[in-house]
Amino acid sequence: AQEVQQSPHCTTVPVGASVNITCSTSGGLRGIYLRQLGPQPQDIIYYEDGVVPTTDRRFRGRIDFSGSQDNLTITMHRLQLSDTGTYTCQAITEVNVYGSGTLVLVTEEQSQGWHRCSDAPPRASALPAPPTGSALPDPQTASALPDPPAASALP
């Protein structure tokens, strides 16, 4: 079965620094998304070989790519405190698959000693189910990884 190897599991960086996230697969992809998880999960980039990458405006001018969609390194530059979060690779295949996630901790330089990564990878559980009635999704459950959905067709 197709898998996404993602590294690192966690990294602590000061404001203004850069971070590399690598997503590796065994091939056969249509493309790859990097999704920032949290109370409102959203894709921040889409990369496909031979296609101009799509980047969320919040990260425009701050992201570089190297490699190919099968072994992609995404470099996020000039990190801000608000960029702290878990980022996961999503490979678009016949059945979409997800990386284990990278927790990026952006800290003010003087406080770096207080915020360190543990060796454990980010916890993987389900994203919130679609809302029913008037209930909003519980942000507590919205910060982990989604179950792979059924294969999604190109528009």
Epitope: Q40, P41, D43, I44, T54, I92, L154
Partner: nanobody, 122 residues
């Protein structure tokens, strides 16, 4: 559950402009990737554009790139399609769609509106 209601369609001359709106009822609008599709008489439904949940990323069909602009106002639960330099071949029923936590370029649409007619003719 999200219900979608399109508006803003009508008759316009070639080269003219229209702005379509799609208002969503229900909660958590900002968790949905939104899209526009269209269907001309006797043809299959065709992808037009999508916009990410935050509004920070957009994607367009080649046939409308540079002429159409998608945008959204999460405070108003509304997504817009600004259509300029309209051509007779843009004549179609335009549908709004929503997908919870969807992907921009691999959009399926969990929820659909009923559509609004756009006719481009002199």
């Amino acid at each position: 559950q999200v219900q979608l209601q399109e508006s803003g369609g009508g008759l316009v001359q070639p080269g003219g402009s229209l702005r379509l709106s799609c208002t969503a009822s229900g909660r958590a609008f900002s968790m949905y990737v939104m899209g526009w599709f269209r269907q001309a008489p006797g043809k299959e439904r065709e992808f037009v554009s999508t916009i990410s949940a935050s509004g920070g990323m957009t994607y367009y069909a080649d046939s409308v790139k540079g002429r159409f602009t998608i945008s959204r106002d999460n405070a108003k639960n509304t997504v817009y399609l600004e259509m300029n330099s309209l051509k007779p071949e843009d004549t179609a029923v335009y549908y709004c769609a929503a997908e919870y936590l969807g992907n921009l370029r691999h959009f399926r649409g969990d929820h659909w509106g009923k559509g609004t007619q756009v006719t481009v003719s002199s």
